[in-house]
């Protein structure tokens, strides 16, 4: 740690005195203190000398000596009082700038330590301090206003009692700055804009901050626009607003608009896009396939995206058949606005019934005309199966009818014993019918197919089963020949209720 000579914490001298302060360290040393006139600074090897041969009240202050090369950063200090009967205060600053909630040191240094008992802090022109001003005094450093507030930004004077009268210092202006958390907050409205050529448009760029020192500008395709600025102050924030008014837009007004605001903390920007079109437009689209297949009893949401300008004058969902003239319930139709010019319309179809298959159309209208988007909804069904015994061209034939969607595949099984359903251990023979005859195949309906199995003689202790399956499920029908005549068994599980 450096050593100061004279080795006293405080030194009191009279004006005009010669003062020499020597600092000695292991390495090079440096003096630091308030900038004040008349000091001469010179080095002599590992010592540094601070001297004046004509001390004035302005030399009052704390002088610190440091060793820049010392990693521990040790220092020594001495406080000098230049005791001037005419000047009780040495004011080191015209202005003090702090952030809110910091301590503000008003550097009125007392030139005579004896005066400490009679000091006070006042506002200029003898006005008292504001209520709740919490302050303390140090003869070495001055008055400290603790946790300074913005409202305490005032002009202050330090007062000392000398011979029964108050002697004031020159004034010190305290500037308490609001803590700026970051760049100004920005809004640019609208977020997106579409206009038909010749229409009017308005774009508003506004920025706000707790501090008045910030700049804001609006630019179009990287060109700064010259727009008069409106300023305001409310909710403890400064606001600056730029409003671009266009009476009749043209294609050159289209493009990217950016609102940019900056302060000492940095820059914020936000952008929007302005589209100028020749005429009204209305576009319908869907991310879904327009041809939908859903299993009966399940639900489906049909979604349509609408892009339109000007806004929609009307819209609705319509069921176009073929099963009934019912219309979708309005409560199942939902509209959400993604932004000003894009909307999503959803039709919810829960627990679909057979009569609800068919075409659903979304219709929308704006000044640009009508547009429609149609979905085709086909229901999927598991196969239903029935078997009968008949004679075709004199031959005994088992006839299997299977109905479902998608079109079912048919397999015949012959197994030993009488059973409702053949299991693997009983199977004697299997026939696949790759091409069953299609009896009916209409849009939105089930597909009915027929498969024939010619049997020369029915074995009485055996079962003939027709199985049909598709992507939804399977169905079967067991045919058991008995002496009194053929007997058929639909399987227990075939109790289908849509």
């Amino acid at each position: 740690i450096p050593v100061i000579e004279p080795s006293v914490p405080e030194l009191v001298v009279k004006p005009g005195a010669t003062v020499t302060l020597r600092c000695v360290g292991n390495g090079s040393v440096e003096w630091d203190g308030p900038p004040s006139p008349h000091w001469t600074l010179y080095s002599d090897g590992s010592s540094s000398i601070l001297s004046t041969n004509n001390a004035t009240f302005q030399n009052t202050g704390t002088y610190r000596c440091t060793e820049p090369g010392d990693p521990l950063g040790g220092s020594a200090a001495i406080h000098l009082y230049v005791k001037d009967p005419a000047r009780p205060w040495n004011v080191l600053a015209q202005e003090v700038v702090v952030f809110e909630d910091q301590d503000a040191l008003l550097p009125c240094l007392l030139t005579d330590p004896v005066l400490e008992a009679g000091v006070s802090l006042v506002r200029v022109r003898g006005r008292p301090l504001m209520r709740h001003t919490n302050y303390s005094f140090s003869p070495w450093h001055g008055f400290t206003i603790h946790r300074a507030k913005f409202i305490q930004s005032q002009d202050y004077q330090c007062s000392a009692l000398m011979g029964g009268r108050k002697v004031m210092s020159i004034s010190i202006r305290l500037k308490v700055q609001k803590v700026i958390p970051g760049p100004p907050a920005l809004t640019l409205v609208p977020a997106e804009l579409v206009r038909i050529r010749g229409e009017a448009a308005q774009i508003v760029c506004s920025a706000s901050s707790v501090d008045v020192n910030f700049d804001v500008f609006l630019q179009h395709n990287n060109t700064k626009l010259a727009i008069p600025q409106q300023s305001d102050f409310h909710n403890n924030r400064y606001q600056k607003v730029l409003t671009l008014n266009l009476d009749q837009v043209d294609f050159q007004h289209a493009g990217n608009y950016s609102c940019v605001a900056s302060n000492v903390q940095g820059k914020h920007s936000t952008s929007m896009f302005f589209r100028v079109v020749e005429s009204a437009y209305l576009n319908l689209s869907s991310e879904q396939n327009l041809i939908q297949e859903v299993t009966v009893g399940e639900g489906l949401n049909l979604k349509v995206m609408v892009e339109a300008y000007p806004g929609l004058q009307g819209f609705n969902w319509t069921y176009l058949g073929p099963f009934s003239d019912h219309q979708p319930e309005p409560k199942l139709a939902n509209a959400t606005t993604k932004d000003t010019y894009r909307h999503t319309f959803t039709l919810s179809l829960p627990r679909l019934k057979p009569s609800e298959a068919g075409r659903y159309s979304f219709l929308a209208r704006n000044p640009g005309g009508w547009r429609a988007l149609t979905f085709e909804l086909t229901l999927r069904y598991p196969p239903e199966v029935s078997v009968i015994w008949t004679f075709i061209n004199g031959s005994g034939t088992l006839l299997c009818a299977a109905s479902g969607y998608p079109q079912p595949n048919v397999t015949w099984l012959q197994c030993s014993g009488h059973t409702d359903r053949c299991d693997e251990a009983q199977v004697l023979q299997v026939w696949d019918d790759p091409y069953p005859e299609v009896l009916s195949q209409e849009p939105f309906h089930k597909v009915t197919v027929q498969s024939l199995l010619t049997v020369e003689t029915l074995e009485h202790n055996q079962t003939y089963e027709c199985r049909a399956h598709n992507s939804v499920g399977s169905g079967s029908w067991a045919f058991i020949p008995i002496s009194a005549g053929a007997h058929t068994h639909p399987p227990d599980e075939f109790l289908f209720t849509p």
Epitope: P34, P35, A93, E95
Partner: antibody
């Protein structure tokens, strides 16, 4: 070794506020006093003002009404704001560390600020 | 207009001694110490002399300063080509309560 680096916009419009920041590295801002000095093209150096580490400031009387110098000890930075600028404020702006006898022992490289519309 | 007065230019040949003057008033040079700065082209000013005649470490002893009354001077002996630069004088001014500068002297090494 103490180093100072100025930063801020190089172009400012007339009547707007010039804002510069000086970042100090290699030493603490919590001692000495920290100055802004400028040099208009082809002219001499002009002292703008200083801030002492405690937040105390003194400004050149010719600029006092337009200047604010502030300190951010947490970032080891100090800042200059000069309001209502005109073309006469076009200059290279330097930040510098001041010693108690009025000498400036460390300087920033300087940043040219042009005031123009 | 600078508060301290310096000649706008000075010149000398290598090896020569050159002196640059700086004059002020009682409120600055007359009552406070003088500092000199060297500014090489495109660089920041560098403290060359402080407290009238003190050299910071690293400054060659070819550079010396002196003060008398309200005037000061900077002498460069054994002039070298790398000394070609602008030289500025400065002093604390009591009425300004801050430092004042000269207009700068451009030294050319011929």
């Amino acid at each position: 070794q103490v180093q100072l680096q100025e930063s801020g916009p190089g172009l400012v419009k007339p009547s707007e506020t010039l804002s510069l920041t000086c970042t100090v590295s290699g030493g603490s801002i919590s001692s000495y006093y920290w100055n802004w000095i400028r040099q208009p093209p082809g002219k001499g150096l002009e002292w703008i003002g200083y801030i002492y580490y405690s937040g105390s400031t003194n400004y050149n009387p010719s600029l006092k009404s337009r200047v604010t110098i502030s300190l951010d000890t947490s970032k080891n930075q100090f800042s200059l704001k000069l309001s209502s600028v005109t073309a006469a404020d076009t200059a290279v702006y330097h930040c510098a560390r001041g010693r108690l006898n009025g000498a400036f022992d460390y300087w920033g490289q300087g940043t040219l600020v042009t005031v123009s519309s | 207009q600078s508060v301290l007065t310096q000649p706008p230019s000075a010149s000398g040949t290598p090896g020569q001694r050159v002196t640059i003057s700086c004059s002020g008033s009682s409120s600055n040079i007359g009552s406070n110490t003088v500092n000199w700065y060297q500014q090489l082209p495109g660089t920041a000013p560098k403290l060359l002399i402080y407290s009238n005649n003190q050299r910071p470490s690293g400054v060659p002893d070819r550079f010396s300063g002196s003060k008398s009354g309200t005037s000061a001077s900077l002498a460069i002996s054994g002039l070298q080509s790398e000394d070609e630069a602008d030289y500025d004088c400065a002093a604390w001014d009591d009425s300004l309560n801050g430092p004042v500068f000269g207009g700068g002297t451009k030294l050319t090494v011929l």
